[in-house]
C-alpha cells in the first residue's frame, strides 16, 4: 500500500499546534485510503527546507526568497502548489514589484543614479531586494556594505529599518528611518506617500499600491512605471512593465520523489472542506494563535503549479537575477557597452555541431548551448542559460506567452532590400502522392499523416486547427489511422510511422528522421498518405536537389497539393491551393538581450549569410544540406521587424487566434507553465 501521508513542516509551537489540528480535522473528513497529514517541527524555514531535501519531511509553505533558497543545490526543491488571493474567478498568485515615478520627471531606469528613492523597508522584497538586486552592478564600488553603496548611488533615500547612524543618507527623506507605521513613509503606502509628497523621485512598491492609494484614475494618471528596457508605461500596464513578478506564498517539495500529486490531492481536499467560508471548527487560512500559520491568512485557496515549472521558471528571470546579485555579489569586471557573446540554443547533436562551427568562425561572438527539444530551449532562454534561437511561428507563440520577444525574421525571397523588408509569410500546404488520386481534403479520415512536429505551424497548428473546426475534438490520433508527429506521446498512433531508433523515436529534433519539413516529406515518400509542410518543401527535395539516397531520384511531378475546396493542384500552384499563410520563422530572445542579439546577428549575417558564394570553402549560416539546422536552409537574410516586435504583432491576429483556439488541444507543458505565470 503506498504511503499517502504528507509530512508537513512547522516552524514554531503555534504552527505545530495548527498542524496537529489540520491533521485531526482532515482525518475526520477524508476516507482512510485518502491522503493524511503528519507534522514535523523544525526550528526555522531553512531547517524545514533541509528536512524535506533529506526526506524527513515532505512540504512547507515559503515566501519567494525562501523558494529561491529551497531551489539551490543541494536542496533542489520545487514549487508544487501556490496560494492564491483575490477571487476564484480571478486568482492572483503573483504580485509585481514596480518602480513608480511622477509623470513629468523625465528620467528612465538607467538614469536612477543621483535620484531620491523611497523604499518600503530595508531587506523587503519589492521595496529593497528586487530594485537593489537589479541595480546591484550599477552601484559604486565597493558594494559592501550594501547600505553604503546604495546611499552613495541615490542622492537621498527613505529606507525604513536602516541604521540611521551609520547610513544617514538612507534616512534623509524620513528622519529616524522608523521601522513601523509610526514612520509615515514606512511600508507600501508609506513609500508611495514619500513619492507623492515630493520627498522622493521614485518609489519601489508593488503594483497594487498605487490602486490602493489612489482610487481616482485621473490621480493615477499623474504617475508612470519605469520599465527595465528604459521606457515608461502607464501604471495599469504593470504586467508589461515591472522589475519582477514575484510569487506570494508557495508550497515546495522534493524535485524527485516529492509526492507532488499527493500534496495537491491533500490541499485540494483541504480547501474543499476547510477553505475560505467553509467550516467554523477549523479554518485553513486563519491563525487564531498567531499570524499566517502554515498558510497566509489572506489566502483564498490553492492552485496546482504545472509540473513543467521548476523554481527558476516560477520565480522568473528578473527575480532570480536580483536575488542572485544580492547573494553572490558578483558583477562583470567593468560594465561596458559592448555586447556579451550571444548563447545560441541548439537542438540535439546535428544543430550543436553546426552551432559549434559557427561559434569558432564567429571569433567569440557566438556561444552554444544544447537542449533536446524546442521547449527546453525556450525554457533555457527564459532563465538565462541561453539567449536566442530561431523558431517556427507555433513556437514563437509559446515563446511569446513565456515572455520572450521576436527580434529578427527569416526572409525566404531574394530582394534588393532583404534586411529591411520582412515578408508576409510562407504557405502551409498538404502534399499527397499523385498516384493516390482519390485522396482529397475531405476524405483524410483513416489515412496516414506526416507532420513536421507537434506545435509547429505548417505541420500542426494550421492543419490541425482546420481539422478541429471540422471534427470539434482533439483526438487527432483517432482521426488518422497512424502517422508521425514528432513530440506526440510515444504510445500515440501519431508516433507509429516515425523512424527514430530507440529513445529517439518520435522525438521533436533531428534524431528523428521524420522530423521537420524534410522529415515529414520523407515520411510521405516512404510510408504516409499526406504530409503537412511548407510550399517550398517539395521543390527543395526533388529533381536531385537533395542528394540523400531516399530523395535523389524524386520528381516534383509525382506529388500534388490538396486544396480546401476538395480539389487538387500541381505543387507549383501553391498560391491558389494552400491551407493558410504562415508567419516566417523568427529569432526570439529575452527583452534584456534584444538589442545585443539584433546587433550581433546582423554582423554575423553580413559575414556568413547568403552573400557567401562558396559554402564548400566557407562557413554558411543558412545552409545545412536540407536539414534546416539553426535556420531554415532557404533563408536569404534575417530581416528587421520594425514595429512588429511582440509575438502578437509578429504572428498577426488571425494566427494568434487560430493557435489560441487549438490551445484546448495543446499538450505543451511549457505553455501550461507560462500561462500559469501570465494567464
Amino acid at each position: 500500500v503506498p504511503d499517502k501521508t504528507v509530512r508537513w513542516c512547522a516552524v514554531s509551537e503555534h504552527e505545530a499546534t495548527k498542524c496537529q489540528s489540520f491533521r485531526d480535522h482532515m482525518k475526520s473528513v477524508i476516507p482512510s485510503d485518502g491522503p493524511s497529514v503528519a507534522c514535523v517541527k523544525k526550528a526555522s524555514y531553512l531547517d524545514c527546507i533541509r528536512a524535506i531535501a533529506a526526506n524527513e519531511a515532505d512540504a512547507v509553505t515559503l515566501d519567494a526568497g525562501l523558494v529561491y533558497d529551497a531551489y539551490l543545490a543541494p536542496n533542489n526543491l520545487k514549487p508544487v502548489v501556490a496560494e492564491f488571493y483575490g477571487s476564484k474567478e480571478d486568482p492572483q498568485t503573483f504580485y509585481y514589484a514596480v518602480a513608480v515615478v511622477k509623470k513629468d520627471s523625465g528620467f528612465q531606469m538607467n538614469q536612477l543614479r543621483g535620484k531620491k528613492s523611497c523604499h518600503t523597508g530595508l531587506g523587503r522584497s519589492a521595496g529593497w531586494n528586487i530594485p537593489i538586486g537589479l541595480l546591484y552592478c550599477d552601484l559604486p564600488e565597493p558594494r559592501k556594505p550594501l547600505e553604503k553603496a546604495v546611499a552613495n548611488f541615490f542622492s537621498g533615500s527613505c529606507a525604513p529599518c536602516a541604521d540611521g547612524t551609520d547610513f544617514p543618507q538612507l534616512c534623509q527623506l524620513c528622519p529616524g528611518c522608523g521601522c513601523s507605521t509610526l514612520n509615515q513613509y514606512f511600508g507600501y503606502s508609506g513609500a508611495f506617500k514619500c513619492l507623492k509628497d515630493g520627498a522622493g523621485d521614485v518609489a519601489f512598491v508593488k503594483h497594487s499600491t498605487i490602486f490602493e492609494n489612489l482610487a481616482n484614475k485621473a490621480d493615477r494618471d499623474q504617475y508612470e512605471l519605469l520599465c527595465l528596457d528604459n521606457t515608461r508605461k502607464p501604471v495599469d500596464e504593470y504586467k508589461d512593465c515591472h522589475l519582477a513578478q514575484v510569487p506570494s506564498h508557495t508550497v515546495v517539495a522534493r524535485s524527485m520523489g516529492g509526492k507532488e500529486d499527493l500534496i495537491w490531492e491533500l490541499l485540494n481536499q483541504a480547501q474543499e472542506h476547510f477553505g475560505k467560508d467553509k467550516s467554523k471548527e477549523f479554518q485553513l487560512f486563519s491563525s487564531p494563535h498567531g499570524k499566517d500559520l502554515l498558510f497566509k491568512d489572506s489566502a483564498h485557496g490553492f492552485l496546482k503549479v504545472p509540473p513543467r515549472m521548476d523554481a527558476k521558471m516560477y520565480l522568473g528571470y528578473e527575480y532570480v537575477t536580483a536575488i542572485r546579485n544580492l547573494r553572490e555579489g558578483t558583477c562583470p569586471e567593468a560594465p561596458t557597452d559592448e555586447c556579451k557573446p550571444v548563447k545560441w540554443c541548439a537542438l540535439s547533436h546535428h544543430e550543436r555541431l553546426k552551432c559549434d562551427e559557427w561559434s569558432v568562425n564567429s571569433v567569440g561572438k557566438i556561444e552554444c548551448v544544447s537542449a533536446e527539444t524546442t521547449e527546453d530551449c525556450i525554457a533555457k532562454i527564459m532563465n538565462g542559460e541561453a539567449d536566442a534561437m530561431s523558431l517556427d511561428g507555433g513556437f514563437v507563440y509559446i515563446a511569446g506567452k513565456c515572455g520572450l520577444v521576436p527580434v529578427l525574421a527569416e526572409n525566404y525571397n531574394k530582394s534588393d532590400n532583404c534586411e529591411d523588408t520582412p515578408e508576409a509569410g510562407y504557405f502551409a500546404i498538404a502534399v499527397v502522392k499523385k498516384s493516390a488520386s482519390d485522396l482529397t481534403w475531405d476524405n483524410l479520415k483513416g489515412k496516414k499523416s506526416c507532420h513536421t512536429a507537434v506545435g509547429r505551424t505548417a505541420g500542426w497548428n494550421i492543419p490541425m486547427g482546420l481539422l478541429y473546426n471540422k471534427i470539434n475534438h482533439c483526438r487527432f490520433d483517432e482521426f488518422f489511422s497512424e502517422g508521425c508527429a514528432p513530440g506526440s506521446k510515444k504510445d500515440s498512433s501519431l508516433c507509429k510511422l516515425c523512424m527514430g531508433s530507440g529513445l529517439n523515436l518520435c522525438e521533436p529534433n533531428n534524431k528523428e528522421g521524420y522530423y521537420g519539413y524534410t522529415g515529414a516529406f520523407r515520411c510521405l515518400v516512404e510510408k504516409g498518405d499526406v504530409a503537412f509542410v511548407k510550399h517550398q518543401t517539395v521543390p527543395q527535395n526533388t529533381g536531385g536537389k537533395n542528394p540523400d539516397p531516399w530523395a535523389k531520384n524524386l520528381n516534383e511531378k509525382d506529388y500534388e497539393l490538396l486544396c480546401l475546396d476538395g480539389t487538387r493542384k500541381p505543387v507549383e500552384e501553391y498560391a491558389n491551393c494552400h491551407l493558410a499563410r504562415a508567419p516566417n520563422h523568427a529569432v526570439v530572445t529575452r527583452k534584456d538581450k534584444e538589442a545585443c542579439v539584433h546587433k550581433i546577428l546582423r554582423q554575423q549575417q553580413h559575414l556568413f549569410g547568403s552573400n557567401v558564394t562558396d559554402c564548400s570553402g566557407n562557413f554558411c549560416l543558412f545552409r545545412s544540406e536540407t536539414k534546416d539546422l539553426l535556420f531554415r536552409d532557404d533563408t536569404v537574410c534575417l530581416a528587421k521587424l520594425h514595429d512588429r516586435n511582440t509575438y502578437e504583432k509578429y504572428l498577426g491576429e488571425e494566427y494568434v487566434k487560430a493557435v489560441g483556439n487549438l490551445r484546448k488541444c495543446s499538450t505543451s507543458s511549457l505553455l501550461e507553465a507560462c500561462t500559469f505565470r501570465r494567464p
Epitope: D356, S359, V360, N361, S362, V363, G364
Partner: nanobody, 112 residues
C-alpha cells in the same frame, strides 16, 4: 600571415589507424578554435571534428568514439587521431581556423 599545413595521411586498411597533424606557421593560431574537414570525391566538404581554445571538442556523429581531436598550443599543432577507420572515411582532410585560407590537405584512403 598564418599558414596551415596538414600531414599524416596515407593508405590504410579498414580497421586501421592514422594520426593527422595540422601545424601552423605564425602566431595566434587557433585562438578561436580549429576545425578538421574532409572532402570525398564528388561530395560536399563536411566537418569532422573541432576543438575550441578552452579544449571543448565535438565530432560528426559517424566518427564519434573512433576519432579524437587534440591540441598542443606550445607546438602550434592540432592532431586528429583516427582509429577503426572505415572506407567511408576516405577523402582529403583539411584543417581550418578563422581568417586563414584552406591548406592543401592530406589524402586519407581506406581500403576494404
Amino acid at each position: 600571415q598564418v599558414k596551415l599545413e596538414e600531414s599524416g595521411g596515407g593508405l590504410v586498411q579498414a580497421g586501421g589507424s592514422l594520426r593527422l597533424s595540422c601545424v601552423a606557421s605564425g602566431s595566434g593560431f587557433g585562438v578561436n578554435g580549429v576545425i578538421w574537414y574532409r572532402q570525398a570525391p564528388g561530395k560536399q566538404r563536411e566537418l569532422v571534428a573541432l576543438i575550441k581554445s578552452d579544449g571543448y571538442t565535438n565530432y560528426r556523429e559517424s566518427v564519434k568514439g573512433r576519432f579524437t581531436i587534440s591540441r598542443d598550443d606550445a607546438k602550434n599543432t592540432v592532431w586528429l587521431q583516427m582509429n577503426a577507420l572505415e572506407p567511408e572515411d576516405t577523402g582529403v582532410y583539411y584543417c581550418k581556423t578563422p581568417g586563414v585560407p584552406f591548406g592543401q590537405g592530406t589524402q586519407v584512403t581506406v581500403s576494404s
